[in-house]
Amino acid sequence: GITNINCSGHIWVEPATIFKMGMNISIYCQAAIKNCQPRKLHFYKNGIKERFQITRINKTTARLWYKNFLEPHASMYCTAECPKHFQETLICGKDISSGYPPDIPDEVTCVIYEYSGNMTCTWNAGKLTYIDTKYVVHVKSLETEEEQQYLTSSYINISTDSLQGGKKYLVWVQAANALGMEESKQLQIHLDDIVIPSAAVISRAETINATVPKTIIYWDSQTTIEKVSCEMRYKATTNQTWNVKEFDTNFTYVQQSEFYLEPNIKYVFQVRCQETGKRYWQPWSSPFFHKTPETVPQVTSKAFQHDTWNSGLTVASISTGHLTSDNRGD
């Protein structure tokens, strides 16, 4: 970067090289060039010469003042106009950054995706800081009192093999950058309560010719968890509102779910599951599209026929035999 150049003087920033976005800042440039009493000192920001708010302090030093500086990053350098020199002489350069101290991390969540071998912890980091912000995830066993710390820039995957202190833990997150430090509330977890079953996947759909045509959705999961509750949501692609069916599921065989749908309409289906009675759900599966026939013939849709889709649509909840409509956010 600009900081690696050979300097013939010194450039510095007040209050600091990393400062809070929106602050007024001063950049100082002091020349130390042999046989040069600078006629003028010039400042450049990202290669553009600055025209305004430059004040000469003394023979060798000038100040550039910025009001309400809002750029996350800028490369600054300054030059001198030396008598009898045709070109400006480079004095020095510095990269500057502006941003915010971290917010208190909240919504700390830790889950174990079945078969992953990891406990995945995530949190809401709050507003964008614009500057390098690190997170330390603290995991403390409630049985042994032993504490482990994990440094990361976003979420963290912790090997379940490293969680040797029993089943109960406290987890909290510390956020820190050059402008400040904050700590989340503590989350108490039990490893058995945070397992999310292996992903449920819709494999195919078929519409069977009958007096009232019926669509069967085939879906499955590789989970070994015995008691699993699932939700399937579906809607016509032109609709905003999801319909939701709930199931208590045993994945020893492929699931078949029946739906009575309007003819000649393109539908989208998604499924998600959780260990019955536990807190965390799987994310919704990839959208599965199926178009019902106009009238009689049998139509099959397979998983490889998926269109791409924004899966961040709307949510639902279910119990066997019930059909509900739900407009809640995910």
Partner: antibody, heavy 119, light 107 residues
């Protein structure tokens, strides 16, 4: 040879508008700043508006007395500089010079164009 | 903005004389000073820049000097064509600012 030719002056009523033009030739337009400097009758010289060179990203400056009323612009394809003057006041009456600056001192000047604001 | 105070406002001198015009800056301008000559009905012409550098084509009887806040323009052996108004300009800090002018008349 550097040449600057102003046009567009004249008599205008208070609150009226005028647009001054300056045709420039004989130098690299992008390497120089262009300014309008005015001289009220029997008075000194005042920088009114400035459009800086490419190295300054064409930053513009306006004297406090004309801020939000005057607009300086340049058309490098035509080698023209303009000064749009709105909401004119009697104190804007002056001879307006188009000038060129490479460093900050004004190296070249046009012949000037008279603007008279009177009811 | 830097203020430039020029003196005298006017002066009268004879052919062949030497005259000096002063310019005082409100703060150190580090030799970033230019001098202009404006003849009646004409646009200003650059005489001197960087306090003492003579612009091409300007007669050598014109010279500039000074440092810090005080600068002067000296005209040796006055000639009739030197009757004009002279302005100083600081370009140390933006925006550049002019002195009020000195009107030189020849007796």
């Amino acid at each position: 040879e550097v040449k600057l030719v102003e046009s567009g002056g004249g008599l205008e009523q208070p609150k009226g508008s005028l647009k001054l033009s300056c045709t420039v030739s004989g130098f690299d337009f992008n390497s120089y700043g262009m300014s309008w400097v005015r001289q009220a009758p029997g008075k000194g010289l005042d920088l009114v508006a400035d459009i800086n060179s490419k190295s300054y990203n064409y930053a513009t400056y306006y004297a406090d007395s004309v801020k939000d009323r005057f607009t300086i612009s340049a058309d490098d394809s035509q080698s023209m500089v303009y000064l749009e003057m709105d909401n004119l006041k009697t104190e804007d009456t002056a001879l307006y010079y188009c000038t060129v600056h490479h460093s900050d001192y004004f190296e070249y000047w046009g012949q000037g164009v008279m603007v008279t604001v009177s009811s | 903005d830097i203020q430039m105070t020029q003196s005298p406002a006017s002066l009268s001198a004879s052919l062949g004389e030497t005259v000096s015009i002063e310019c005082l800056a409100s703060e150190d301008i580090y030799n970033n000073l230019a001098w202009y000559q404006q003849k009646p009905g004409k646009s200003p012409q650059l005489l001197i820049y960087h306090a003492s550098s003579l612009q091409d084509g300007v007669p050598s009887r014109f010279s500039g000097s000074g440092s810090g806040t005080q600068y002067s323009l000296k005209i040796n052996s006055l000639e009739s064509e030197d009757a004009a108004t002279y302005f100083c300009l600081q370009d140390s800090e933006y925006p550049p600012t002019f002195g009020g002018g000195t009107k030189l008349e020849l007796k």
